[in-house]
Structures are given as C-alpha cells and as structure tokens.
C-alpha cells in the first residue's frame, strides 16, 4: 500500500523547547488508518485517523526534538481483505531545524 505524505505544519518551532506539529496523510482510499510517527527508528507517537479522514496531525510537546535523533518518518496501517493487517512503507523523511541565533 502506498507510503503516506508527511510535512511540518505551522506554527513552526523556533527553538528546541517549542512544540512540533507534523501532519501525516494516507492516500484517498485509506481513511481511518492507524498512524505511527517514528524518530531514530523508534516510535514517538501513535494516532488513529477518524473514519472519515485520511490523515492525522501529531503534536509533540516541547523538547521532543532532543531525542532520539534523526529525521521523522510516518507510516500507517490498515485492515485489508479478510481482516488482514497491512502496513504502508515509510514516508519520506522530515527534518526539524531551528533558526540560527543572530547574537
């Protein structure tokens, strides 16, 4: 099943203490999927989309950018034919960067 799309959504973090908002979207024919957000190979958060929606927005509290390292990816799972679980591939990576202080 196709990989989801992923993107940072406003307000964008300006420091490591700011919350991070990441939207993950499945293709149109997979509403109500279970979404996983990864960083550094491990799970950061799980969310299920409402049955009439194709995606979710992960809201990570301040400090989430500190560990584990690496870019964020998301993935979704659905129940396919005969109630068999299916998993998408990973999304493209999304990196979170912060403005360089001018002082």
């Amino acid at each position: 099943i196709p990989a989801p799309s992923i993107r940072l959504v406003p307000p964008y973090p300006s420091s490591q203490e700011d919350p991070i908002h990441i939207a993950c979207m499945a293709p149109g024919n997979f509403p109500g999927a279970n979404f996983t957000l990864y960083r550094g190979g491990q799970v950061v958060q799980l969310l299920q989309a409402p049955t009439d929606q194709r995606g979710v927005t992960f809201n990570l509290s301040g400090g989430s950018s500190k560990a584990p390292g690496g870019p964020f990816h998301c993935q979704y799972g659905v129940l396919g034919e005969l109630n068999q679980s299916q998993l998408s591939d990973l999304s493209e990576p999304v990196n979170v960067s912060f403005p360089v202080p001018t002082w």
């Epitope: 990864y38 491990q42 799970v43 799980l46 690496g70 799972g77 591939d89 493209e92 990576p93």
Partner: antibody, heavy 117, light 116 residues
C-alpha cells in the same frame, strides 16, 4: 547493549506445534516493532512477520499466514512465535529481530527447529 | 521471476572495490524503494549494514564503516552496495531487502570472496 535470546527450538514431528520465545534486553522493548525471520540450511533469510509495539497490529508473510501466530508481552520484554501444523520445509534457524522503523537492525543468535518424523 | 535478484557470487582483491547489485523485477521501479543491506558470516545472524533510497534518504547502520555505501542504478533497475578498500573480514554473504506488497522480501544473496 541490545540483546535478543531465542529459545524453544528442537526436533518436532510433522503436524505438531511449537512455541518459540525471544527474550529482549538493553532497549525499551515496548517502543519497537519486532520480527521473526527464518533461514533454512544453506538458504537466504525469509521474513515471517512483524508485530507492532503495542501488539495490536501483526502482519504475516503469505507463506505462513494461518499457521504462525506472533505475539508479545511487553511487561516481560518477550516476543513469541506459535507454529502449528509444522512441515518438513519449516526446518530452519528461527531468529527474532528488533524493529528499526518497520525494518529490523539487530538479530538474535537464533534457535534451530528441525521438523522430522 | 524473483522480486529481487542478486548474483550468486563475486570475487575481488584486497584493497579493491566491490559492487554488489540487487536487481528488482521488471515492473517494480527501484526509484520508489528503500533498499536495505545485510552482511552474514558463517554461523552468525545477518548484520544490518545500511539502507538507501536516495542521497537525502539513507541511513548507515550503527558502527558500520563508511567504506560501505549504497546507491542505485536506475537504468538497470538495481540497488547497489559498494564496498571500497576491501578487507579479508568483508568475506561474507550479502543480502538485499525491500518492503514490497506489505512484506519484507530478501534477495537470494551474493557470496563475496576476498582473494588472496
């Protein structure tokens, strides 16, 4: 240090059942998907299935769906593989592997299962 | 036809480079896949080396030397594992792997021999 230790292998007759265990340590077990992979003598690895962190989502390879059941107990840091209706072609070394995203990076040393009458 | 095809064997000299290929079946576009590579030595489980999709989406395994690198050959519809500065300890079986149709699929493996 990440450690995975499989157990429960041995010689079993065709048609019988076997349950393998994988004891995990050195990482936050509940934050990672886990896999079972097998390797028949002289052959390449064959992926059997993945169970996600919370245990509610399991995906199996077509070749074993219906005969194998993967489960986990996060309170015991343990992964399980229940194998039913065993066949000669199930003879292999069975590895558990730690999830890396939904792939896997670290493997255990494996446990040998021999199906023979 | 297998999903992933690897040459059964490859030989190279110490200090040289070895290019191991993993060809995807016709109709499966290598550009859309992350290709994972594992090394296996006799009597040991496979060890994760790296994954490669593009230069902006790649990941080196923990402790894996930089002389192991991934790339793709779009014209051949293949993933490539490049090992530079070959050493005797690189002699092993190498497997590629992709996530295809909601399952992990391995190639048949390449046995790399380091001559001398």
């Amino acid at each position: 240090e990440v450690q995975l230790v499989e157990s429960g292998g041995g010689v079993v007759q065709p048609g019988r059942s076997l349950r393998l265990s994988c004891a995990a340590s050195g990482f936050t077990f509940s934050s990672f998907a886990m896999h079972w992979v097998r390797q028949a003598p002289g052959k390449g690895p064959e992926w059997l299935g993945i169970i996600l962190y919370e245990g509610g989502h399991v995906v199996y390879a077509d070749s074993v769906r219906g005969r194998l059941t993967i489960s986990r107990d996060n309170s015991k840091n343990t992964l399980y593989l229940q194998m039913d209706s065993l066949r000669d072609e199930d003879t292999a070394v069975y590895y558990c592997a730690k999830g890396f995203y939904h792939a896997f990076d670290v493997w255990g040393q494996g446990t040998m299962v021999t199906v023979s009458s | 036809q297998a999903v992933l095809t690897q040459p059964a064997s490859l030989s190279a000299s110490p200090g040289a480079s070895a290019s191991l290929t993993c060809t995807l079946r016709s109709g499966i576009n290598v550009g859309t896949y992350r290709i994972y590579w594992y090394q296996q030595k006799p009597g040991s489980p496979p060890q994760y080396l790296l994954r490669y999709k593009s230069d902006s989406d790649k990941q080196q395994g923990s402790g894996v030397p930089s002389r192991f690198s991934g790339s793709k050959d779009a014209s051949a519809n293949a993933g490539i594992l490049l090992i530079s500065g070959l050493q005797s300890e690189d002699e092993a079986d190498y497997y590629c792997m992709i996530w295809h149709s909601s399952a992990w699929v391995f190639g048949g493996g390449t046995q790399l021999t380091v001559l001398g």
